[in-house]
């Protein structure tokens, strides 16, 4: 990548990107550009949209000049009877621009959802659907009683009118968050993921957390009482420290784990919460990772096969997460 030249941006102001298109730094970290979308040509200077799981596929290693924005392997989405590839954007109606990301669809409104506050020149604003127009528009009604203007003007909320608090921008956002996926490992440290647009700019992003359904070294079957077939949530005698890539959790945790059954059922997390865990590494570095903590487990026959790509929906999803 040739970033030796001095940074020179086409315009000093950040460009205005179409709905659903991310504003990103170019590959040299110089200029903010509108990210290229699925199937579009890309270069090191014109990167693909990372928020949609896209990467610039240059084909042969020899060619590092121009590529095509390609989706990292991710689950497709079925929406309104159509199938969309992960990373693909589409307009679900004239009002919404949607994106598929790893099986989940997130949409941003194309119509302004701005709050029109009462003002002296428009004391009674009202949204109406105009013929031939997709989006509703504001109209101003004349007050029947001129004395009503005063109280109407007092109705504004400070946060709505004074600044760019992104949580107010989110009024334009259809917040969607998938359930956490099942832990990637049935024992030991694994990863659980979800897709959400519950963030500052309503962008679809993939979140991950560490998870441990049960320790691998625990022989839980011998704890099953006579006459019982399952141990749903075995008691772990002592607090544990978690290990991750040679790093150890700073604190000890009296964590709950899921048990096992002897009748072919499997026990998986049912209600969970997500908490930050600090890990200290041998070189002294401290890293903070979100981790799943189990509240309750459920034992059931919906067990995933080792190579079953159509894992049961029950198993794939984590219900009742508190965070």
């Amino acid at each position: 990548q040739d970033c030796s030249a001095q940074c020179q941006c086409a315009a000093e102001a950040a460009p205005h990107c179409p709905a659903g298109v991310s504003l990103v730094l170019d590959g040299c970290g110089c200029c903010r550009v509108c990210a290229k979308q699925l199937g579009e040509l890309c270069t090191e200077r014109d990167p693909c949209d990372p928020h949609k799981g896209l990467f610039c596929d240059f084909g042969s290693p020899a060619n590092r000049k121009i590529g095509v924005c390609t989706a990292k392997d991710g689950a497709p989405c079925v929406f309104g009877g159509s199938v969309y590839r992960s990373g693909e954007s589409f307009q679900s109606s004239c009002k919404y621009q949607c994106t598929c990301l790893d099986g989940a669809v997130g949409c941003v409104p194309l119509c302004s959802m701005d709050v029109r506050l009462p003002s002296p020149d428009c004391p009674f604003p009202r949204r109406v659907k105009l013929p031939g127009k997709c989006c509703e528009e504001w109209v101003c009604d004349e007050p029947k009683d001129r004395t009503a203007v005063g109280p109407a003007l007092a109705a504004y909320r400070l946060e709505d009118t004074f600044g760019p608090d992104p949580t107010m921008m989110r009024a334009n956002c259809l917040v969607q968050t998938t359930e956490w996926s099942a832990c990637s490992k049935t024992c030991g440290m694994g990863i659980s993921t979800r897709v959400t647009n519950d963030n500052t700019f309503c962008r679809l992003e993939k979140q991950s957390r560490l998870c441990m359904v049960r320790p691998c070294e625990a022989d839980l079957e011998e704890n099953i009482k006579k006459g019982k077939k399952c141990i749903r949530t075995p008691k772990i005698a002592k607090p544990v420290k978690f290990e991750l890539s040679g790093c150890t959790s700073v604190k000890t945790y009296r964590a709950k784990f899921c048990g096992v059954c002897t009748d072919g059922r499997c026990c998986t997390p049912h209600r969970t919460t997500t908490l930050p865990v600090e890990f200290k590494c041998p070189d002294g570095e401290i890293m903070k990772k979100n981790m799943m903590f189990i509240k309750t487990c459920a034992c059931h026959y919906n067990c995933p096969g080792d190579n079953d790509i159509f894992e049961s929906l029950y198993y794939r999803k984590m219900y009742g997460d508190m965070a």
Epitope: L158, F162, G163, T167
Partner: antibody
């Protein structure tokens, strides 16, 4: 009555970390964000960063690698941390409420010197 | 990098109208810049006057008003009073950060 009050050390050595606390009253940190601004002696204002009411943060790019802003809503406190302080960071540091910067703290003067 | 420019000083006689400009170096000032105006009275703390281009903060008299046009935002003060003598700062929001202007000293003559 809305008030904001900055507290923290008045003297910091070069390379040390500055930690300031903004304690607010008369409003909730879950309703309003809080900005940090500084004013070097005899100069104008410089915006440093903000923690929004929902906990998100935005920082001045020039200080991104050195700045952390966090909050404890239950204690009505916002904590501002700036690492690797330098004599050029000598200034009066203010916290101000989001919403037109309508209310400000009285400021705390921080001197960076060995 | 965005630069916000204000005149170093303006002056006016009591009762007059003065305006202070706030120019953005990177093009038109829009409602998305949420132009803010802040007052610093001599020897006292700061106080917000205007937010979101033209919205007065609670308790601010209607002699103070904010507007925008082209590449500038403006603060207008009508019926100038001796107690308006202060430093005035504007701040513009650029997608991820605010930038303050250099400040304008307002002198009330007489």
């Amino acid at each position: 009555e809305v008030t904001l009050k900055e507290s923290g050390p008045v003297l910091v050595k070069p390379t040390e970390t500055l930690t300031l606390t903004c304690t607010v009253s008369g409003f909730s940190l879950s309703t309003f964000g809080v900005h940090w601004i500084r004013q070097p002696p005899g100069k104008g204002l410089e915006w440093l960063g903000v923690i929004w009411r929902r906990g998100g943060t935005d920082y001045n790019a020039a200080f991104m690698s050195r700045l952390t802003i966090s909050k404890d809503t239950s204690k009505s406190q916002v904590v501002f941390t700036m690492t690797n302080m330098d004599p050029v960071d000598t200034a009066t540091y203010y916290c101000a409420r989001d919403g037109g910067f309508d209310y400000w703290g009285q400021g705390t003067t921080v001197t960076v010197s060995s | 990098e965005s630069v916000v420019t204000q005149p170093p000083s303006v002056s006016g006689a009591p009762g007059q109208r003065v305006t202070i400009s706030c120019r953005s170096s990177i093009g038109a000032v829009t409602t998305s810049n949420y132009a803010n105006w802040v007052q610093q009275l001599p020897g006292t703390a700061f106080k917000g006057l205007i937010g979101g281009t033209s919205n007065r903060a609670p308790g601010v008299p209607d002699r103070f008003s904010g507007s925008k046009s082209g590449t500038s935002a403006s603060l207008a003060i009508t019926g100038l009073q001796a107690e308006d003598e202060a430093d005035y700062y504007c701040a513009l929001w650029y997608s991820t950060h605010y930038v303050f202007g250099g400040g304008t000293k307002l002198t009330v003559l007489g």
